[in-house]
């Protein structure tokens, strides 16, 4: 049962932060106008992934598209490519998971496909994840430079009459966004890994021999490691109730599907 | 097309407060415009007083900001500019006006005239 | 406050000739994020309210006809009326309106020569 909601969690949690991941990618706030000292501004600017866009206290909004690719900085780019792998890899890794489902049959696949593809589906969650956490962090650390480079250059033309204020650019909401569901994304892949310990049958990778000693009912068995996943050992030292020598074989029942819940 | 009318008083007395009222015609006070307060002393140039915007935010011209208040009645597609203590250098003609694209006033009512005196 | 300086004070320009406004303001009025200067212009004829004929300092409202141009970017901006007619006759202001409070220029009253 808690293998069942351990991968059940994972997926919702990834779920909910792949959604994130998509809902920052296309978000036009990934840096906005930094207000300082004026909370209140008739011209407010914020940027995106895709676009820029300007906001006038009267009203009018107006998004213009970067419609070069090759004039674009390289770091945009880059911010541009974690997010879209991870849009991809999280996408990939919810569809093996729908079917990696313990509570999804299909025909008679066997619990050890089961495993794997929650292993999968994990381990993509868990790159999805990280590409956003990076995406969203390397387009950050471009805004903190930015930030002291134009706090630097402040006002220009300060000797003679006229005066510019330079716009500066603070963390926009699709940063935090960003942060979260990558996050989420992350934790939900970790469940599905640890749902996978759960969800492997218990088998040997070799055949374990049991030995009878004189005077003893006794049966002495190695730990054997779960072969298809690597993880845990077999804890499980059976009695054998009869005389001679036997391999584990001929004596272990193995688990059917059917007694996991 | 958005049409603005402006009523009120036409003759205040010092230190009296100043009321007056637009009212928008052709176009919702909700919609994504400003409504703004502008004002034209006899012989003079335009001063903005301040503005309520489509979302109820105001701002005001630091020269004026103690004195005024702008509000909005969205019932009866009405805004209202209220001047406290008013002195004879407050006599202009007051203009209520709609801003969108560029933030410049694209619709102009046909202007008041307050007269400050006792 | 951003200051706003028309010059001339006043124009008397010949019928069908070319009337040049001049509008300086003491911060730039160019908004980086979209490149566009916040800068309008506005025709006043006597007991009428101001009539919008030039928005971003360089677009035309619409019905406004196409002899009236406007130019410049940053701090220097003009309007040009390119062929003056008799209904230009009118007091003409630029306004900025990039940053609170927006301003008004005091003025340029066009006359007939």
């Known amino acids: 049962m808690a293998v069942t909601a351990c991968q059940g969690l994972g997926f919702v949690v990834s779920l909910i932060g792949i959604a994130g991941i998509i809902a920052a990618t296309c978000m036009d706030q990934w840096s906005t106008q930094d207000l300082y000292n004026n909370p209140v501004t008739a011209v407010f600017n914020y940027q995106g992934l895709w676009r820029s866009c300007v906001r006038e206290s009267s009203g009018f909004t107006e998004c213009r598209g970067y419609f070069t690719l090759l004039g674009l900085p390289a770091m945009l780019q880059a911010v541009r490519a974690l997010m879209i792998v991870g849009i991809v890899l999280g996408a990939i890794g919810l569809l093996v998971s729908i079917f990696a489902l313990k509570c999804i049959r299909i025909g008679s696949m066997e619990d050890s496909a089961k495993a794997n593809m929650t292993l999968t589906s994990g381990i993509m969650f868990i790159v999805s994840g990280l590409c956003a956490i990076a995406g969203v962090s390397v387009f950050a650390n471009m805004l903190v430079t930015n930030f002291w480079m134009s706090t630097a250059n402040m006002y220009t033309g300060m000797g003679g009459m006229v005066q510019t204020v330079q716009t500066r650019y603070t963390f926009g909401a699709a940063l935090f966004v960003g942060w979260v569901a990558g996050g989420l994304t992350l934790i939900g892949g970790v469940m599905m890994c640890i749902a996978c310990r759960g969800l492997a049958p218990e088998e040997t990778n070799y055949k374990a021999v049991s030995y009878h000693a004189s005077g003893h009912s006794v049966a002495y068995k190695p730990g054997g490691f779960k072969a298809s996943t690597g993880f845990g050992s077999n804890t499980k030292n059976k009695k054998i109730y009869d005389g001679g020598a036997r391999t584990e074989d001929e004596v272990q029942s193995y688990p059917s599907k059917h007694d996991y819940v | 097309q958005v049409q603005l009318q402006e009523s009120g008083p036409g003759l205040v007395k010092p230190s009296e407060t100043l009321s007056l009222t637009c009212t928008v015609s052709g176009g919702s006070i909700s919609s994504n415009y400003a409504w703004n307060w502008i004002r034209q002393p006899p012989g003079k140039g335009l001063e903005w007083i301040g503005y309520i915007n489509y979302s109820g935010n105001t701002a005001y011209n630091p020269s004026l900001k103690s004195r005024v208040t702008i509000s909005r009645d969205t019932s009866k597609n009405q805004f209202s500019l209220k001047l406290s203590s008013v002195t004879a250098a407050d006599t202009a003609v007051y203009y209520c006006a709609t801003s969108y694209y560029g933030n410049s006033f694209i619709y102009w009512g046909q202007g008041t005239l307050v007269t400050v005196s006792s | 406050d951003i200051v706003m300086t028309q010059s001339p004070d006043s124009l008397a320009v010949s019928l069908g000739e070319r009337a040049t406004i001049n509008c300086k303001s003491s911060?730039?009025?160019?908004?980086?994020?979209?490149?566009?200067?916040?800068l309008a212009w506005y025709q006043q004829k006597p007991g009428q309210p101001p009539k919008l004929l030039i928005y971003?300092?360089?677009t035309r409202e619409s019905g406004v006809p196409d002899r009236f141009s406007g130019s410049g970017s940053g701090t220097d901006f003009t309007l040009t009326i390119s062929s003056l007619q008799a209904e230009d006759v009118a007091v003409y202001y630029c306004?900025?309106?990039?940053?609170?409070?927006?301003?008004f220029g005091q003025g340029t009253k066009v006359e007939i020569k």
């Open positions: 306004q900025q309106a990039y940053s609170f409070p927006w301003t």
């Open positions: 971003w300092a360089s």
């Open positions: 911060q730039s009025l160019l908004n980086s994020g979209n490149q566009k200067n916040y």
